[in-house]
């Protein structure tokens, strides 16, 4: 015969633990129900009655199954120079992120401590890894046959156009110049852009020093000053 399903509250078997979404109440010495995300424990369980849950009030939340007496307060409103990427709801805290073109270089419990500008790759270098909300752009030198003629945190290296007759060969920072009226194959005009950073929860990410025009944020690393990376044009 199948074992009888116990309904909360119930006394656990000696040596066993409570089931998923239940907790052991020390006072009642019973397994009791947790409250779902967006709720909190209004009345704790007894030997004869289960936990009574209630919804979180405005500007408060619980993200996990819980038995807390009060919901957590949402963080303060995002300042005018931050972007709210996640609103405060009963089930999640507000998340404020850095303005476009900046990323969180140092984080703290309540969000970001220091926003820093995303590195810009100078001509001859393209974006190898785009920036995110919590990590800087990584630049790389343009490989032979490719170029970037912009100072940008989003442009990648693009192939040189192929000419019937080359007037000026391309290099890492300049496209090839053709003598004929049109090249045999050319890329679509305009720079290639990588997508802007997607929102992620703030966390500390050590940036990788790379060629750039934006200041290197290697100041976050626990070491003394080092020479700028090759191709860097920062002050």
């Amino acid at each position: 015969l199948p074992a009888q399903v116990a309904f909360t509250p119930y006394a656990p078997e000696p040596g066993s633990t409570c089931r998923l979404r239940e907790y052991y109440d020390q006072t009642a010495q019973m397994c009791c129900s947790k409250c779902s995300p967006g709720q909190h424990a209004k009345v704790f369980c007894t030997k004869t009655s289960d936990t009574v849950c209630d919804s979180c009030e405005d500007s408060t939340y619980t993200q996990l199954w819980n038995w807390v007496p009060e919901c957590l307060s949402c963080g303060s409103r995002c300042s005018s120079d931050q972007v709210e990427t996640q609103a405060c709801t009963r089930e999640q805290n507000r998340i404020c992120t850095c303005r476009p073109g900046w990323y969180c270089a140092l984080s703290k419990q309540e969000g970001c401590r220091l926003c820093a500008p995303l590195r810009k790759c100078r001509p001859g270098f393209g974006v190898a890894r785009p920036g995110t909300e919590t990590s800087d752009v990584v630049c790389k030198p343009c490989a032979p046959g490719t170029f970037s003629n912009t100072t940008s945190s989003t442009d990648i290296c693009r192939p040189h156009q192929i000419c019937n007759v080359v007037a000026i060969p391309g290099n890492a920072s300049m496209d090839a110049v053709c003598t004929s009226t049109s090249p045999t194959r050319s890329m679509a005009p305009g720079a290639v852009h990588l997508p802007q950073p997607v929102s992620t929860r703030s966390q500390h990410t050590q940036p990788t020093p790379e060629p750039s025009t934006a200041p290197s944020t290697s100041f976050l690393l626990p070491m003394g000053p080092s020479p700028p990376a090759e191709g860097s044009t920062g002050d």
Epitope: C104, K108, R113, A116, P117, T213, F219
Partner: antibody, heavy 119, light 107 residues
Framework: QVQLLQSGPELVKPGASVKLSCKAS????????INWVKQRPGQGLEWVGW????????KYNEKFKGKAILTVDTSSNTAYMNLHSLTSEDSAVYFC????????????WGTGTTVTVSS | DIVMTQSHKFMSTSVGDRVSITCKAS??????VAWYQQKPGQSPKLLIY???TRHTGVPDRFTGSGSGTDYTLTISSVQAEDLARYYC?????????FGQGTKVEIK
């Protein structure tokens, strides 16, 4: 309201050290970095460094490494700056300052402490 | 380090006049510029951030403008209480740096 109250003026001899204090009130002390800024008589402002009270993380302007040491006492909501091997160049008003957000402009300034180095 | 240059150490003006204080950064600072007012014997006070956003409680006669490397603080109608030194600051990269200050004097 948010306030940063700094210690009184200091007259010190060349080669000596001095410890300046900055007592915070009206906000959660451990949640915001405290910065220190130097102002020499008739001159501009120079950023010395920051300290994050929650974990003691510090960052110094290269120019002040070895000259200034920043510390905090979270039990008294006080930030400190130790200045070492003082010379006449260190005679200045020193301000502590706080920022609200993750961009580093300073919206709350301390009252300032005048340090005079003289024999 | 980014150098912030305030070309005028002093500016003499009359009550009611318009005055513009300039600040030039040694590199593009993406409007990460703040302006402070420091009256004699007092601590600096934040006026403007992000080049043009007025801080809470700052009178609307103070306006900031600029982008790239060139920034301006304008007082549209100078009042006697505006006698002070004004500093620009960049918060684009560490170390944070300030201009040398421009002292506004009332004729």
């Amino acid at each position: 309201q948010v306030q940063l109250l700094q210690s009184g003026p200091e007259l010190v001899k060349p080669g000596a050290s001095v410890k300046l204090s900055c007592k915070a009130s009206g906000y959660s002390f451990t949640s915001y970095d405290i910065n220190w800024v130097k102002q020499r008589p008739g001159q501009g402002l120079e950023w010395v460094g920051w300290i994050y009270p929650r974990d003691g993380d510090t960052k110094y302007n290269e120019k002040f490494k070895g000259k200034a040491i920043l510390t905090v006492d979270t039990s008294s909501n006080t930030a400190y700056m130790n200045l070492h091997s003082l010379t006449s160049e260190d005679s200045a008003v020193y301000f502590c300052a706080r920022l609200t957000g993750p961009y580093w402009y300073f919206d709350v300034w301390g009252t300032g402490t005048t340090v005079t180095v003289s024999s | 380090d980014i150098v912030m240059t305030q070309s005028h150490k002093f500016m003499s003006t009359s009550v009611g006049d318009r005055v513009s204080i300039t600040c030039k950064a040694s590199q593009d600072v993406d409007t990460a510029v703040a302006w402070y007012q420091q009256k004699p014997g007092q601590s600096p006070k934040l006026l403007i951030y992000w080049a043009s956003t007025r801080h809470t409680g700052v009178p609307d006669r103070f306006t900031g403008s600029g982008s790239g490397t060139d920034y301006t603080l304008t007082i549209s109608s100078v009042q006697a209480e505006d006698l002070a030194r004004y500093y620009c600051q960049q918060y684009y990269s560490v170390p944070w740096t300030f201009g040398q200050g421009t002292k506004v004097e009332i004729k």
